[in-house]
Interface confidence: low
């Protein structure tokens, strides 16, 4: 056969869907790969072709686009289930092509089985909502495409295992859920179970997202340098070992970048020729607040390292701080001979 | 084979409420959703709302919100359309339609209810 | 709402003729790839009658001289060859939105 652009194996696009559920998944070749959309393909007069590979088998084989009840069936660039089986996991190819052109990419979907109370392998979406904020939604996830909006679905709401109904302050409304004010104990997995009826069948689409309550830009403030401060002074003789922790606390700021650094003298330690190592932790508050730490360690310090200027750095997206840490060189105390002979003038 | 089979003629005054059924065979009732749809004397025609026989919700046009009341019996199969504080404007042809998925199409018909208001 | 606008509003095609009807929609009814667009015949008397869905999909028993096509706004209904029994009043609808609307028809005579 003639020569295909094989993308190989988008493991990037590792497709979960739950068992005996529909399922529309698009030709990824589109979407990440070509220039092109597929009508434009398809106005060029190139063909769509699936097929697939069964878990734990080599073997590639074409769809069978002939089940009873159109189970699974192409329309443009999307592959239908309706619905999916356990077996229905596997590697799927979509092939674009003509008598001179040809393109392909493979995708891992798998379809996986949920319990009665929604638990399963599946890898789940993380919403954070904001502390004591006022009214936040969420929305049921990827139902799109699967009826039009003339169709009014029944969508039932679950937090864990129970359904959401008189809950003091989360409400259902259709396919948002709402959150009056979000408290630490709203933290959990939301389930929407979405169900319409499609030739002369009834549908469920199930999703489930992790909620997680998150500190509020009201309360944001920028980092604060818990260490060094004014309070402690670094003192060693040369040859102990220098360890100078800076210790930064973040407020939780959606989508900001926080970052600590040393600088000796002003540069980098990087750019430094002194035998210097940082060493990172971090942790977070239950709202994910974050304390970064970084211990700046000199294993034998010199003199001349005792006199240099070491400074901690942080930056978020509210500002950026610096605080000096105070290092000085221990004096050695006095022996008592030597003050008692200078004491006396003795020669 | 699927029908729908609407209930006879309706003369009615100005001002009273009229209750058209629709029964459905040849299929599973619950498993559709029903449209009604009106038509004028030699007009187009008129979407009025639908109903899920299943849990009994409806979707109405605004036009039609205060006018039109959706209803269905699941044990005979039968929706039903109430229509109140009648005018000579609600002269006219309801049809009962069966809407398909995934085209949302309307692929059955009903015989059509004509109802003439008239002192 | 959506509006959708048929032309023309009659028209007369003499027998084995082509028969073009139009139908713009206000706002694209395309809805993932599928457009939402239908095709329907009135006959006098009677109850409309599905010939074609998702704009090119002919229901089942409608005859092969039916065909539908177009995409986003714009869609066309054409009859070739036109029969005796053609004669009717054809409609548009589209079902991408609530609420459902309906062209103003299209009255085809046969010469």
């Known amino acids: 056969s003639e020569r295909c652009d094989d993308w190989g194996l988008d493991t990037m696009r590792q497709i979960q869907v739950f068992e005996d559920e529909p399922a529309r998944i698009k030709c990824p070749l589109f979407e990440h790969f070509l220039k092109f959309n597929y009508s434009t393909a398809h106005s060029a007069g190139l063909t769509l072709i699936w097929y697939w590979t069964r878990q734990d088998r080599d073997l590639e084989e074409p769809i069978n686009f002939r089940l009873p009840e159109n189970r699974i069936s192409k329309e443009k660039d999307v592959l239908w289930f309706r619905p999916t089986l356990l077996n229905d996991t596997g590697n799927y190819t979509c092939m674009l092509r003509n008598t001179t052109y040809c393109s392909k990419v493979a995708f891992p979907l798998e379809v996986v089985q949920k319990d009665s109370c929604f638990n399963s392998p599946m890898k789940l979406p993380v919403h954070k909502l904001y502390i004591e904020y006022g009214i936040q939604r969420i929305t049921c996830p990827n139902v799109d495409g699967y009826f039009p909006s003339s169709v009014k679905p029944t969508i039932t709401w679950y937090m864990g295992c129970y359904k959401i109904q008189n809950f003091n302050n989360v409400i259902p409304e259709g396919m948002n859920l709402s959150f009056l004010i979000a408290l630490i104990s709203n933290n959990g997995n939301y389930t929407c179970v979405v169900t319409y009826p499609e030739n002369g069948r009834t549908f469920h689409l199930t999703r489930t997202l992790t909620v997680k309550v998150v500190g509020s830009p009201k309360n944001a403030v920028p980092p604060v340098i818990h260490s060094p401060n004014d309070h402690v002074v670094y003192e060693k003789e040369p040859g102990e070992e220098l360890l100078i922790p800076c210790t930064v606390y973040f407020s939780f700021l959606m989508d900001s970048r926080n970052e600590v650094w040393w600088t000796i003298d002003g540069k980098k330690p990087d750019d430094i020729t002194i035998d210097v190592t940082i060493n990172e932790s971090i942790s977070h508050s239950r709202t994910e607040d974050e304390t970064r730490t970084q211990i700046l360690s000199i294993k034998k310090v010199t003199s001349e390292d005792l006199k240099r200027s070491y400074v901690c750095h942080a930056r978020s997206a509210k500002g950026e701080v610096a605080k000096a840490a105070k290092v000085k060189q221990k004096v050695p105390a006095p022996r008592y001979t030597v003050e008692l002979a200078c004491g006396f003038g003795a020669t | 084979e699927v029908q729908l089979q609407q209930s006879g003629p309706e003369l009615v005054k100005p001002g009273a409420s009229v209750k058209i059924s629709c029964k459905a065979s040849?299929?599973?009732?619950?498993?559709?959703?029903m449209n009604w749809v009106k038509q004028s004397h030699g007009k187009s025609l008129e979407w009025i709302g639908h109903?899920?026989?299943?849990?009994?919700?409806?979707t109405y046009t605004e036009k039609f919100k205060d006018k039109a009341t959706l209803t269905v019996d699941k044990s005979s199969s039968t929706a039903y359309m109430e229509l109140r504080s009648l005018t000579s404007d609600d002269s006219a042809v309801y049809y009962c339609?069966?809407?398909?998925?995934?085209?949302?199409?309307?692929?059955?018909w009903g015989t059509g209810t004509t109802v003439t208001v008239s002192s | 709402d959506i509006v959708l606008t048929q032309s023309p509003a009659s028209l007369a095609v003499s027998l084995g003729q082509r028969a073009t009807i139009s139908c713009r929609a206000s706002e694209s009814v395309n809805f993932h790839g599928t457009h939402l667009m239908h095709w329907y015949q009135q006959k006098p008397g009677q109850a409309p009658k599905l010939l074609i869905y998702?704009?090119?999909n002919l229901d089942s028993g409608v005859p092969a001289r039916f065909s539908g096509s177009g995409s986003e706004t714009d869609f066309t209904l054409n009859i070739h060859p036109v029969e005796e029994e053609d004669a009717a009043t054809y409609f548009c609808q589209q079902s991408i939105e609530d609420p459902f609307t309906f062209g103003s028809g299209t009255y085809l005579e046969i010469k």
């Open positions: 040849g299929y599973t009732f619950t498993d559709y959703y």
């Open positions: 339609v069966r809407r398909i998925g995934k085209n949302w199409h309307c692929d059955v």
């Open positions: 109903i899920n026989p299943n849990s009994g919700s409806t």
């Open positions: 998702a704009a090119s």
